[in-house]
């Protein structure tokens, strides 16, 4: 099994900050920066393919061995195809050599080839041909070598170029150990650990769950502590059998037919709930019976359910240009509590019998989709119009079927809504009055009739008719209160009258306007 890797050297992670020694100085290996995936990357490169007799060395800095006995060297590099150079570059090579040297001290810039032992000749699996080079497709090779046992305090690696066109993009040195073991449904790999201090002679290692086991959501993963002696101690965290499996000794076994398990947990497999079909082995859920469904948010342990029947009873009570709709809950809830209602509206012109949607022209006391209450008021209805309202009952599984459960009610609107009246301006002898009615009703209005009289005078009143939405009442007495009412007149007769408003003329010349 893969051991935990303790990294001793990582060239790529240092982002060009490691100054390695080159020999001969100023020739051969060179630290280069390039751009890959819009990020700067660093590499040591050499490409003396036409000069012949190359012997260029690149030596790492001194690496402290720590507790490692065997080290692993991972190289990522690219090598250009010798045939991509003119005339094949006769002295060109496609390999380089990897060396190491152990020492108890850092020799600094004192470099001697004879101190180094060859590990291997490194050859690429894939060479970079001309087309890849031009297209900047870096053919990255990964090679790993193991060296050991090591006995000195530290070591150097060295790379010898003998005439290749090569770039080293990554050099990573690490070590590992501790025997593989199985604990609490987790497998722990071979690892080598270093005593962090005398007080803490343990290294923490993460385990991997056995087949069909996972780390619980939000939980702590399986951890063990590896001592310098290679012993495992103090397990932390756990693995749980994944959905469809339950724990049997140190393994996870598939649920039996008729049982299921929907999530990773310590619990055993559960029996399939009501209105489901018997499951097969290893089931993570049980399928619903025909006509029954499961909403996306329903727990798999919950019985399957179905859409509700229509609202049981529906009434529509007209109130001028408003209608109050009331209904009662469906008799069959489908086994669910999440019932909501939606109201839609259709209007029909009595003269032509033509019908159409009126969703855009009416106002609802609350949004007509997903109502939880069993009543709603609809306003801004047009006079002399027939309305049909549909109330649909839905629940969490209604979207999963094509049929709808609804009831309808019809109502005729005979009057316009009363105009909303306001005082725009006044003087000692006049009152300027304006009003409004909902836009959908305006096309029905032929004229507006303004009736006014002095407050306290029950014997006489004045009437003023107009096409517009405002009128100025002249010839009034100063400092006097007048009772004013506005009524819409339609071809079919009178609409609803406004409230009777009290407006007073100014008693003396003063401010001619009144803020309303």
């Amino acid at each position: 099994a893969q051991g935990k890797e303790v990294v001793l050297l990582d060239f790529a992670a240092m982002k060009g900050e490691l100054g390695w020694l080159t020999h001969p100085y100023g020739k051969g290996w060179d630290l280069m920066q390039n751009i890959m995936n819009d990020m700067p990357i660093y590499m040591y490169s050499v490409c003396n393919v036409v000069s012949g007799d190359q012997d260029n060395w690149l030596r790492t800095n001194w690496v402290y061995r720590e507790e490692a006995e065997r080290i692993f060297i991972e190289l990522k590099f690219t090598v250009r195809d010798c045939n991509s150079f003119p005339g094949g570059a006769s002295s060109c090579k496609e390999t380089f050599n990897l060396y190491y040297a152990e020492s108890d001290v850092d020799y600094g810039t004192n470099f001697q080839k004879r101190q180094f032992t060859k590990i291997d000749t490194i050859a690429p699996d894939e060479i970079t041909v001309s087309s890849d080079f031009e297209a900047r497709n870096v053919k990255l090779n990964v090679e790993e070598r193991m060296v050991g046992p090591l006995t000195r305090k530290g070591f150097y690696l060295a790379f010898q170029d003998i005439g290749a066109c090569v770039a080293l993009l990554s050099v990573r040195v690490y070590y590992k150990k501790c025997p593989e073991m199985l604990q609490s449904l987790a497998r722990f790999p071979e690892t080598i650990a270093v005593a962090v201090s005398d007080a803490q002679p343990l290294a923490t290692v993460a385990g991997t769950c056995v087949d069909h086991a996972v780390v619980p959501y939000g939980g702590e993963g399986p951890l063990m502590h590896c001592t310098v002696d290679g012993e495992w101690l103090v397990p932390i965290g756990q693995c749980l059998c994944q959905e469809g499996y339950e724990k049997v000794e140190d393994a996870c076994q598939a649920c039996s037919p008729g049982f299921f398990k929907s999530e990773a947990s310590e619990s055993p497999c559960l029996q399939c709930p009501e209105h489901t079909l018997p499951s097969t082995e290893g089931a993570t859920s049980c399928q619903c019976e025909e006509g029954y469904f499961r909403a996306p948010e329903d727990p798999l342990s919950m019985p399957c359910t179905r859409p509700p029947s229509a609202p049981h009873y529906l009434t529509a009570i007209g109130m001028g240009a408003k209608v109050e709709l009331r209904w009662t809950a469906p008799q069959d809830t489908g086994g669910r509590k999440d019932i909501v209602y939606s109201v839609t509206c259709e209007q029909c012109w009595p003269e032509s019998g033509e019908c159409g949607s009126c969703e855009a022209s009416v106002q609802y006391s609350e949004p007509p989709q997903a109502l939880t209450r069993t009543s709603v008021t609809v306003s801004d209805l047009e006079p002399h119009m027939n309305y049909t309202f549909t109330v649909e009952a839905r629940n969490g599984v209604s979207d999963l079927v094509n049929s709808r459960s609804f009831r309808t009610a019809s109502v005729s609107i005979n009057q316009t809504e009363p105009p909303k009246v306001r005082l725009e301006d006044r003087s000692t002898t006049s009152l300027s009055v304006a009003w409004s009615i909902p836009v959908p009703q305006q096309s029905r209005v032929w004229k507006y009739e303004v009736t006014y009289r002095k407050k306290g005078d029950a014997n006489s009143y004045n009437v003023h008719r107009t096409d517009g939405f405002s009128v100025t009442l002249d010839g009034l007495a100063p400092g006097t209160t007048y009772l004013v009412q506005v009524q819409a007149l339609t071809q079919e007769g009178q609409g609803a009258g406004s409230k009777v408003h009290e407006f007073q003329t100014l008693s003396t010349e003063g401010s001619a306007t009144m803020a309303v």
């Epitope: 920066q33 390039n34 751009i35 050499v46 490409c47 003119p86 080079f133 900047r136």
Partner: antibody
């Protein structure tokens, strides 16, 4: 021997169009990245556009983007530069230049390219 | 775009002199720099690429050095054929910008 020969230059009015050609010989044209570089009278060099060995990708200097189009016909060993909406500031000698990775002795290609081979240039004058 | 600044813009020298031209980039371009020589009425010629690599057929009296933002071109023993204008060019970005040129004249 590598040879690049430009043609198609001449006098054109502002707003006009011109198509430059560059005939290549003495090398495998389809291996080369090709480019156009210009030099206004008495001034320095300015890179204009490049095209990859197989016809892509293409890049353009900001000053010509949307007006100039680089293309190549590897079967005819010819590079083209279609110049539209020409301006007085486009007046220059236009050089055709090439780059072959075989002559680039580096292990990993640079982010862009330099120019190993150049034609003798063709003069484009934009004036009314 | 990366700006390339050459200095000096011109210089006078004698045959046999050692001449150095510098080129400064407005941001780091690693070693992605080329040098060209141009004579009046002629096309430029490549001298050096990747800051220090001599192009095939270029005399060894030409050498280049530098990395990051500071670069130089040195002619170790000026020859009569070397009197020309020299340009640096970065190819660290797709804009591939040139320096404004340095004219080397006979003293």
């Amino acid at each position: 021997e590598v040879q690049l020969l430009e043609s198609g230059g001449g006098l054109v009015q502002p707003g006009g169009s011109l198509r430059l050609s560059c005939a290549a010989s003495g090398f495998t044209f389809s291996h080369y990245m090709m480019a156009w570089v210009r030099q206004a009278p008495g001034k320095g060099l300015e890179w204009v556009s490049r095209i990859g060995p197989s016809g892509g990708p293409t890049h353009y200097a900001d000053s010509v983007k949307g007006r100039f189009t680089i293309s190549r016909d590897n079967s005819k060993n010819t590079l083209y530069l279609q110049m539209n909406s020409l301006r007085a500031e486009d007046t220059a000698v236009y050089y055709c230049a090439g780059y072959d990775s075989g002559y680039d002795y580096v292990a990993v290609a640079g982010p862009a390219e330099y120019f190993q081979h150049w034609g003798q240039g063709t003069l484009v004058t934009v004036s009314s | 775009d990366i700006q390339m600044t050459q200095s000096p813009s011109s210089l006078s020298a004698s045959v046999g002199d050692r001449v150095t031209i510098t080129c400064r980039a407005s941001q780091s371009i690693s070693t992605w720099l080329a040098w060209y020589q141009q004579k009046p009425g002629k096309a430029p010629k490549l001298l050096i690429y990747k800051a220090s690599n001599l192009h095939t057929g270029v005399p060894s009296r030409f050498s280049g050095s530098g990395s990051g933002t500071e670069f130089s071109l040195t002619i170790s023993g000026l020859q009569p054929d070397d009197f020309a204008t020299y340009y640096c060019q970065q190819y660290n970005s797709y804009s591939r910008t040139f320096g404004q040129g340095t004219k080397v004249e006979i003293k």
